[in-house]
Interface confidence: low
């Protein structure tokens, strides 16, 4: 059976196909192409007469197309009015006609889009913004990207208008982006350049810094004070509910007990127009709170060096304290090989090499104070020769 | 209730031409990417084509294979041309639901045998 | 050969947990989303899980699915002999830009 097929069937605009001819047969007078899905001779593209192997264009050529002895149609320089539907048929030496109808479809190389926003200055959990990727066009797909990544599954995630429009319901700091949209046809594609969204929110429950509350009169009381926020938060000082200055930072040298009392962190975003507070105790005291002698424990003494691991515990009753851990008048961690967990309470050395052989102590402090524990010793032995390379199996 | 339904399967000679139909019901069609799957007797899943949703009516070709879709008769169709006997397999016609952001299919029909044996 | 790659066989008793593997590539498992599709003998297909671990409404919370790089899992608990049946995994592959099937593992229950 005559069967034509179109190679490619999707074309670019302005690039050429190939109407391809299967199970031609063999006796034939000669064969004509129209344009359409039946034999109309004022829709005539071209005739070929196998005797004079002579083509005759017919009302429909646009000097665009070429005929093969095999029946075969090229079409250069297509335009998307092109598309369609075209009949071959084939005038065989029985004098039987024989049709056979193809088709294919020109689509145009798409632009570079661009996308526009009804809001590119949010406020979070308060604002929508859709980004529409433009232009608009025929037989185009859509799609989005975030972060270089395809749209996540999200409720907060809407698509319209044919996935040209999309949604963001109750933006969040994170929902900055950048975003990208791609258009799509079967035979181009194309991506926008990336939008940022600058997303306002904030200011979040404020930090100050340092966490100490303890202070030695003749100190110098230095706060920072930081909250999330954008654009960065107004800053302000109270002290015991009496304003003292707009800044970030409070400095006070020389403190007396008369500067021990309630430090306010005020942060304030003036674009969304929310306000948050977070209160300090200071206690300026010529009193040490002693810090007891920590207890250093480990879960073993003597281990196997690149075998075994470590822990090393150290134990006190004081809180509002800090630890750290020395090694050889060393502080730790020093390598990669140890970690520090529960708070500093626990160094762990996993595995243990022959130079962590040593002694370690813990020291426990405050503002105020410090305490050493006493020393402990770890002994590394080797029983028997390591790998020759460190890699384990697998 | 959604429902598809194939027809158009049958014993066909090969090089053989063969159009399958889906209709559907129960849902709003244009709003679907709408795909083809078959199945050779005893054999694994195999993809065959996907048309896009809306608008209008959509063409996606795959070697012999064309697949398209008519949406105001909310049919679609896959119309098989010179067909092999590797071809003979139980074909199902299958929604996607998720516009092809990702791929899946929540329904399929009950499928229609294609025969292709001379 | 399929392009994701299942055991043909799984079995496993009355109640048991069983867990079914599909392993692909960066361009299909690794970077879309799975599903997993129950096919009982002389049916057409059903899906179980899209979208990595979605159940759609209607199955039940026995199926489970997960994914970890480029490999996806089923897991059935409790398993009943309603079970006994074939079962794909699917995911698009951006690379065939194509949508591509596991071979299919066939789940018995002893």
């Known amino acids: 059976q005559l069967t034509t097929e179109s190679m490619p069937f999707n074309v670019a605009e302005g690039k050429e196909v190939l109407l391809l001819v299967h199970n031609l047969p063999q006796q034939l007078f000669g064969y004509s192409w129209y344009k359409g899905e039946r034999v109309d001779g004022n829709r005539q593209i071209v005739g070929y007469a196998i005797g004079t192997q002579q083509a005759t264009p017919g009302p429909a050529n646009s000097g665009r197309e070429t005929i093969y002895p095999n029946a075969s149609l090229l079409i250069q320089n297509v335009t998307q009015n092109d598309t369609g539907f075209y009949t071959l048929q084939v005038i065989k030496s029985d004098l039987v006609n024989e049709e056979a109808t193809g088709q294919f479809h020109v689509y145009p190389e798409l632009p570079k889009p661009s996308i526009s926003s009804n809001n590119s200055n949010p406020v979070e959990d308060k604002d929508a913004v859709a980004f529409t990727c433009e232009p608009e066009t025929q037989d185009t797909t859509y799609l989005w990207w975030i972060n270089n990544q395809s749209l996540p599954v999200s409720p907060r995630l809407q698509l319209s208008n044919g996935n040209r429009t999309l949604t963001l319901l109750s933006v969040t700091r994170n929902d900055t982006g950048p975003y990208e949209c791609e258009i799509q046809n079967p035979v181009s594609a194309n991506r926008s350049d990336p939008v940022t969204l600058n997303v306002t929110y904030g200011p979040d429950t404020p930090t100050i810094s340092p966490s100490d509350t303890y202070y030695r009169p003749g100190a110098n009381l230095s706060l920072s004070c930081y909250a999330a926020s954008n654009p960065p938060a107004q800053y302000s000082w109270l002290i015991n509910g009496t304003f003292q200055q707009s800044t970030q930072e409070l400095f006070i040298p020389n403190i007396t007990v008369n500067n021990s009392g309630s430090y306010t962190c005020h942060a304030n975003n003036s674009v969304t127009g929310c306000n948050r507070t977070t209160v300090k105790t200071i206690i300026v005291t010529e009193l040490s709170p002693v810090v007891a002698k920590p207890q250093i424990k480990a879960s073993k003494t003597t281990v196997t060096g690149d075998k075994d691991s470590v822990n090393l515990t150290c134990s006190t009753n004081d809180t509002g304290i800090s630890i750290r851990w020395f090694f050889k008048n060393q502080s730790l961690p020093s390598s990669e090989r140890m970690k520090l967990s529960q708070g500093n309470t626990t160094l762990s050395i996993n595995p243990v090499k022959r130079e962590d052989a040593g002694t370690y102590w813990c020291e426990v402090f405050n503002p105020i104070s410090k305490n050493q524990s006493d020393p402990i010793m770890l002994n590394v032995n080797y029983n028997a020769l390591p790998q020759e390379n460190g890699l384990s199996p697998g | 209730e959604v429902q598809l339904l194939e027809s158009g399967g049958g014993l066909v000679q090969p090089g053989g031409s063969l159009r399958l139909s889906c209709a559907a019901s129960g849902f709003t069609f244009s709003n679907y990417a709408m795909s083809w799957?078959?199945?050779?007797?005893g054999k694994g899943l195999e993809w065959v084509s996907w048309?896009?949703?809306?608008?209008g009516k959509g063409l996606e070709w795959v070697s012999r294979l064309t697949i398209s879709r008519d949406n105001s008769k909310n049919t679609l169709y896959l119309q098989m041309n010179s067909l092999r006997a590797e071809d003979t397999a139980v074909y199902y016609c299958?929604?996607?639901?998720?516009?092809?952001?990702?791929?899946?299919?929540?329904?399929w029909g009950q499928g229609t045998l294609v025969t292709v044996s001379s | 050969q399929s392009v994701l790659t299942q055991p043909p066989s799984a079995s496993g008793t009355p109640g048991q947990r069983v867990t079914i593997s599909c392993s692909g590539s960066s361009s299909n498992i690794g970077n879309n989303y799975v599903s997993w599709y129950q096919q009982l003998p002389g049916t057409a297909p059903k899906l179980l899980i899209y979208a990595d671990s979605k159940r759609p409404s209607g199955v039940p919370d026995r199926f489970s699915g997960s994914k970890s790089g480029t490999s996806a899992s089923l897991a059935i608990s409790g398993l009943r002999s309603e079970d006994e049946a074939d079962y794909y995994c699917g995911a698009w592959d951006a690379s065939l830009n194509g949508y591509v099937f596991g071979g299919g593992t066939k789940l018995t229950v002893l």
């Open positions: 299958a929604r996607d639901p998720t516009k092809g952001y990702a791929p899946t299919f929540d329904y």
């Open positions: 048309v896009r949703q809306a608008p």
